[in-house]
């Protein structure tokens, strides 16, 4: 075709995958009457007429196109739908009239990739390899066309490098005229990289312009020796008896050596391998004295069977041992002295303190309570506390129980009981003295007898008021073989509507169990009368 | 120092008395009670009775009682043992054993033997 | 009455050996934190001699390797490393109520 040589570039049209490519026809009027145009695609040199413009009605051709074009514009421009990669090619619109002109339209495709896909090397990578090895693989799939990938380490786009860095890419066409791209970054690392963020950047063009997309970022296991190990404790500070305490062994290498911890023998001086768990700590818990001494961790290289030592470390348990108190279980005649000594061992420093267990009061500060001129009032519990000052909640106690020689004390001397007539009333009796007294009644009932502890006894009596009981009353005696002493009881009869919530009286109520000759429960009121407690 | 010491033992025939005396020393003898404990030849110890000087009260084994009898004098710091009816089987070491109100024994006599036979 | 159980009844082990005899009360022997369990040792010819009150406590003068445990029912008495002076027979005592009752002993002898 003469002049085919000064054919102007064709039009640029840029368009996305899927959307609708505008083909305007731009031949001029006295190049040729847009009411009569032939389209052709251009493809390999072949042209194929895809469309007819007759007297501006168009008619598509048979074959890829058919379904896909139509006329807008007044027939100037044709529209393509759908567009996909395999459209990027040179359309041509050809007016017939007054002579063959042509007008050529260069169609582009775009698509831009998904996001890219990385995927680290899962086996990781020796520091001491010969040439580089496969770091990670960038996938980047359906871009048009081949988008262009960029590695990065730690943020610094990485460049080809002979022996040290090489990026391997290929491409794959999917069915839908897409490019899959796979981009393989191989490298020589070092043991600094064991940290070091990679990604792969995606750069590609759409009709807006230049885009690009990133990867996660991610890092790659690096192997490298182990050149030191050491111990770690858990938790840091001062450590004492009931901790949970964990000791593990820590190498700078990777993979870690095998692990192994071991306890220096106090008696033999030898190393003995102690036992961990599945993840090589050994959990002391709870901690004990025993557990002091030097550990030391041994690393050994599977691969190379070459065995690194921890320095070791000494481990102290704190501890307070069991308290000893002696006398353990003193026995004094009323006047007489007792020294109360304290005795403990411990890693550290102790204090010590007496206190009265009933009331709490600090009575001495130190190892050593002199109690002098004792009286009853005197017994009871005394407890000493051996703690370490420098370790809140390190500490131990015992306590001691001091029996004072003496008859039996009664809780009470006299008390006034308010009862009803066939009620099974329950009455309680409470002595101590040293030896522990025996209580018994002088009415016959069922008595049990309770021992609140090594000094202090409780009988309680469950008996049927009757009249007789009325007018006797109940004793309590109380006896060991140092004396006797006896409590009173007065029975008194009252009608229940008495008992109310406003009655002036000061004492608590005891419950009694209906026995058969009562129709229902009722309650006694136990009132002590206005006196001291007896002394016996 | 503390010290108990028995005494009063013998060779008697069955049905007959025996007395045994507990000479206490080092130790204020009304303070504590006084206990006797006795073991046949190659058996175990079985408590018998006990007394507390300060009062004059005492407690018997169930065993024993109606046949042995506890005294004391308080001056001569001394315990006493009487033993009527004697049987074959009361043959054994007789041991005084001194406690306080918690009834264990921190010192004993060095024991007498009684021995039953015809 | 309270029946006390020894066991074992005899037993042998050599001067070094760690030991326990068991004692077992037909009822509870403690009151609120007190154990009225006793151990004694007795050497042929010889009275008894007390080694552990209340349970646990170590009577003055007698070594530390000697040691008791226990509450209630059930009462240990444990000699940590045996000296040949240890050859003995050993008896529990309850003294919880009357009458007071002794185990049948134990007899320690020489492997």
């Known amino acids: 075709v003469p002049g085919e040589a000064e054919q102007p570039a064709p039009e640029l049209v840029e368009v996305e995958v899927g959307s609708t490519a505008l083909l305007k026809c731009g031949l001029s009027q006295s190049q040729g009457n847009l009411s009569h145009v032939d389209w052709f695609s251009v493809h390999k040199e072949k042209r194929t007429l895809i469309f007819r413009v007759r007297q501006g009605q168009g008619q598509s051709e048979p074959g890829e196109y058919e379904q896909r074009l139509s006329l807008q514009d007044r027939g100037a421009t044709l529209a393509l739908t759908q567009v996909t990669p395999q459209d990027e090619r040179i359309f041509l619109c050809q007016g017939k009239r007054p002579r063959s002109q042509e007008y050529r339209i260069q169609l582009r495709v775009y698509k831009a990739p998904e996001e890219p896909n990385i995927q680290v090397n899962p086996l990781g990578i020796p520091v001491n390899s010969k040439e580089p090895e496969e770091v990670a693989t960038c996938v980047g799939r359906n871009g048009y066309p081949i988008p262009q990938v960029i590695w990065y380490k730690n943020g610094r786009p990485l460049k080809e490098e002979k022996n040290r860095v090489h990026i391997q890419s290929s491409q794959t066409v999917e069915s839908s005229g897409l490019y899959t791209l796979q981009s393989i970054l191989k490298a020589q690392l070092v043991k600094e990289d064991k940290d070091a963020q990679f990604y792969c950047e995606l750069n590609y063009r759409l009709p807006s312009g230049n885009h690009m997309k990133e990867s996660r970022e991610v890092t790659v296991p690096v192997f490298y020796p182990t050149e030191k190990v050491w111990l770690e404790v858990e938790p840091v500070g001062m450590l004492k008896e009931g901790d949970r305490v964990e000791i593990r062994c820590l190498a700078d290498g990777n993979p870690p050596p095998h692990f192994s911890i071991s306890k220096q023998n106090p008696s033999t001086r030898e190393a003995e391998e102690e036992t961990t768990n599945d993840n090589g700590v050994l959990v002391l818990e709870p901690a004990r004295k025993e557990h002091s001494g030097r550990y030391e961790c041994q690393g050994l290289d599977l691969d190379t069977m070459i065995s690194l030592l921890s320095e070791p470390q000494e481990l102290l348990v704190n501890y307070v041992s069991d308290v000893r108190v002696s006398p353990a279980a003193p026995e004094r005649q009323e006047g007489s002295s007792l020294t109360l000594t304290c005795e403990a061992e411990s890693s550290q420093d102790l204090e010590f303190q007496w206190l009265r267990e009933e009331t709490g009061q600090v009575l001495e500060r130190g190892p050593v309570l002199q109690l002098h001129d004792l009286k009853r009032e005197a017994g009871g519990g005394y407890r000493c506390v051996a703690s370490v000052p420098s370790i809140p909640g390190l500490n131990r106690t015992q306590l001691v129980n001091v029996a004072i020689f003496g008859p039996p004390w009664m809780a009470f001397k006299e008390r006034k009981v308010w009862v009803k007539e066939n009620m099974v009333l329950n009455l309680s009796c409470e002595a101590s003295g040293h030896p522990r007294p025996t209580i018994s009644w002088n009415v016959n009932g069922t008595a049990s007898e309770q021992d609140q502890d090594p000094q202090r006894v409780l009988s309680t009596l469950n008996v049927l008021v009757t009249p007789e009981l009325l007018e006797t009353g109940v004793e309590c005696t109380a006896s060991n073989d140092l004396g006797k002493n006896t409590s009173i009881l007065f029975l008194e009869l009252v009608n229940l509507t008495t008992l109310t919530p406003d009655s002036n009286t000061t004492t608590g109520l005891s419950t009694s169990t209906a026995s058969p000759h009562t129709r229902a429960n009722s309650t006694s009121t136990e009132r002590k009368l206005p006196e001291p407690e007896s002394r016996g | 120092q503390v010290q108990l010491v028995e005494s009063g033992g013998g060779v008697v025939q069955p049905g007959r008395s025996l007395r045994l005396s507990c000479a206490a020393s080092?130790?204020?003898?009304?303070?504590?009670?006084i206990h006797w404990v006795r073991q046949a030849p190659g058996k175990g110890l079985e408590w018998v009775a006990r007394i507390y000087p300060g009062t004059d009260i005492t407690y018997y084994n169930e065993k024993f009682k109606g046949r042995f009898t506890l005294s004391r004098d308080n001056s001569k710091n001394t315990l006493y043992l009487q033993m009527n009816s004697l049987r074959a089987e009361d043959t054994a070491v007789y041991y005084c054993?001194?406690?306080?109100?918690?009834?264990?024994?921190?010192?004993w006599g060095a024991g007498t033997m009684v021995t039953v036979s015809s | 009455d309270i029946v006390m159980t020894q066991s074992p009844s005899s037993l042998s082990a050599s001067v070094g050996d760690r030991v326990t005899i068991t004692c077992r009360a037909s009822k509870s022997v403690s009151i609120s934190g007190y154990s009225y369990m006793h151990w004694y040792q007795q050497k042929p010819g010889k009275a008894p001699k007390l080694l552990i009150y209340?349970?646990?406590n170590l009577e003055s003068g007698v070594p530390s390797r000697f040691s008791g445990s226990g509450s209630g029912t059930d009462f240990t008495l444990t000699i940590s490393s045996l000296q040949p002076e240890d050859f003995a027979t050993y008896y529990c005592?309850?003294?919880?109520?009357?009458?007071?009752?002794f185990g049948q002993g134990t007899k320690l002898e020489i492997k």
């Open positions: 054993a001194r406690s306080g109100g918690y009834w264990y024994f921190d010192v």
């Open positions: 080092g130790f204020t003898f009304s303070n504590y009670w």
């Open positions: 209340l349970a646990s």
């Open positions: 005592q309850h003294s919880r109520e009357l009458p007071y009752t």
